[in-house]
């Protein structure tokens, strides 16, 4: 794993414990909470990051929790079960034996049930819409410059291949970033759009997951782009299965 050899840290995941106990004394990093080895040359899976987040003591949190983001979905925080590859297991249960099915980004896609609930497969989230509203500026950003800047960011910071950024829409002050990645498109080694979206979400909230890298400083031709609210919508390859009672509520 390409962790920084000199001081043995994980550049892409600060929620790790690293030591030079890999083959040949190489630096090896393990995710907090799960103890799973992570590849520090790429993004860590969202499942392992959520598990690490839940394992961190509440009073010794290393990440900032900004107060100005009123739309943080704290209900979405749970201690997930991850498979040996670090992906979400299709069925998640809490300590009171309440279970539900999730998609590949760990978002619930069925009604809650008991231990008899079956989740046959992990359904892939193939389309993510990141909806942002930026703080007021003197004028609108140039659409092409904004578009290019966000595409550059996903390439450089999150290592997401440019083919997976489908579109960037802008109607001041709303910015929408569309990420698309079908199962057939995702090659070995490609960053998952769900992981990239999660890192971006945490960056926007001032809770960067990167080690020893400055926080996100988004600028368009030198003009700061400050986000004041974020909503993320997930579309699955197979539609979710909720009861009509929930849908009409």
């Amino acid at each position: 794993h390409t962790a920084a050899q000199d001081n043995c840290t994980c550049p892409t995941n600060k929620m790790t414990v690293c030591s030079p106990d890999g083959p040949g004394g190489r630096c090896q990093c393990r995710a907090l909470g799960s103890g799973m080895a992570v590849d520090c040359s790429t993004l860590t899976s969202k499942c392992l990051l959520l598990k690490a987040r839940m394992s961190a003591p509440k009073n010794a949190r290393t990440l900032v929790r900004p107060s100005e983001h009123a739309l943080v979905d704290n209900d979405g925080l749970y201690d997930p079960d991850c498979d040996p590859e670090g992906r979400f297991k299709a069925r998640q249960c809490n300590q009171t034996s309440v279970c539900w099915c999730v998609n590949s980004v760990g978002v619930r896609r069925t009604d809650k049930g008991d231990l008899s609930l079956r989740c046959d497969e992990l359904v892939r989230t193939h389309h993510i819409l990141i909806d942002l509203r930026h703080r007021p500026t003197a004028g609108a950003f140039n659409h092409s410059d904004l578009d290019a800047e966000l595409r550059r960011l996903f390439r450089e910071r999150y290592r997401l291949h440019p083919k997976f950024v489908a579109a960037v829409h802008y109607e001041q002050p709303t910015i929408q970033i569309e990420l698309r990645q079908n199962t057939s498109q995702k090659a070995a080694g490609d960053v998952d759009i769900g992981d990239a979206a999660y890192y971006f979400e945490r960056d926007i909230k001032g809770e960067s997951l990167f080690q020893g890298r400055g926080g996100l400083d988004l600028r368009v031709r030198g003009e700061p782009l400050q986000v004041e609210r974020t909503l993320i919508y997930y579309l699955d390859e197979i539609p979710p299965k909720f009861s009509m009672k929930r849908l009409t509520a």
Partner: antibody
Framework: EVQLVQSGPEVKKPGASVKVSCKAS????????IGWVRQAPGQGLEWIGE????????YYTEKFKGRVTMTADTSTSTAYMELSSLRSEDTAVYYC??????????WGQGTLVTVSS | DIQLTQSPSSLSASVGDRVTITCRAS?????MYWYQQKPGKAPKLLIY???TLASGVPSRFSGSGSGTDFTLTISSLQPEDFATYYC?????????FGQGTKLEIK
């Protein structure tokens, strides 16, 4: 095999325009980015800008904005860079380079553009 | 714009020598990239993500650094290594290159 093949050398008069082509093969053209870099004789590398081939999104550096136009023809997998209002200091080798999760992973062979009266 | 300053600008060395080229950024960057260019040829990607060798690059090349200070090291110079080396960043637009370091035979 990934290849970027550029058009041949050009000699232009000051004030004229030049259009350099970059024909790609060996990869899915619209999945990538083509960046343009120039190198004046005996000098270093200077980035001009880039075009996202799938969306047509373009970013030009401030220095070249207004004088450069980047386009792509997806039917022939060819990217183009046109520079107008040429002056003698635009004499350089112009390179196209493919971008992915790296800024430039494969480069064209370069096109020498000479601006002389 | 982020300025990259390479040192030295030129360097004379012999086959078998250990050579280090430094690249200093005017503000912090995430990663540094290094390219090798031989006369009349296009640049070739040598090192990406500060320290990872590009495909086919010999292990005598290595890269290190973080923040604003980065280095390219050639542990034992070979005849084919005499070329010009450039560092480059893309942590922010516009992408910028160092002015280059010309490595010549002593």
């Amino acid at each position: 095999e990934v290849q970027l093949v550029q058009s041949g050398p050009e000699v232009k008069k000051p004030g004229a325009s030049v259009k350099v082509s970059c024909k790609a093969s060996g990869f899915t053209f619209t999945d990538y980015v083509i960046g343009w870099v120039r190198q004046a004789p005996g000098q270093g590398l200077e980035w001009i800008g880039e075009i996202y081939l799938g969306s047509g999104t373009i970013y030009y550096t401030e220095k070249f904005k207004g004088r450069v136009t980047m386009t792509a023809d997806t039917s022939t997998s060819t990217a183009y860079m046109e520079l107008s209002s040429l002056r003698s200091e635009d004499t350089a080798v112009y390179y196209c380079a493919r971008g992915s999760i790296f800024p430039f992973d494969y480069w064209g062979q370069g096109t020498l553009v000479t601006v002389s009266s | 714009d982020i300025q990259l300053t390479q040192s030295p600008s030129s360097l004379s060395a012999s086959v078998g020598d250990r050579v280090t080229i430094t690249c200093r950024a005017s503000s912090s960057v995430s990663y540094m990239y290094w390219y090798q260019q031989k006369p009349g040829k296009a640049p070739k990607l040598l090192i990406y993500d500060t320290s990872t060798l590009a495909s086919g690059v010999p292990s005598r090349f290595s890269g290190s650094g973080s923040g604003t200070d980065f280095t390219l090291t050639i542990s034992s110079l070979q005849p084919e290594d005499f070329a010009t080396y450039y560092c480059q960043q893309w942590s922010s637009y516009p992408y910028t290159f160092g002015q280059g370091t010309k490595l010549e035979i002593k």
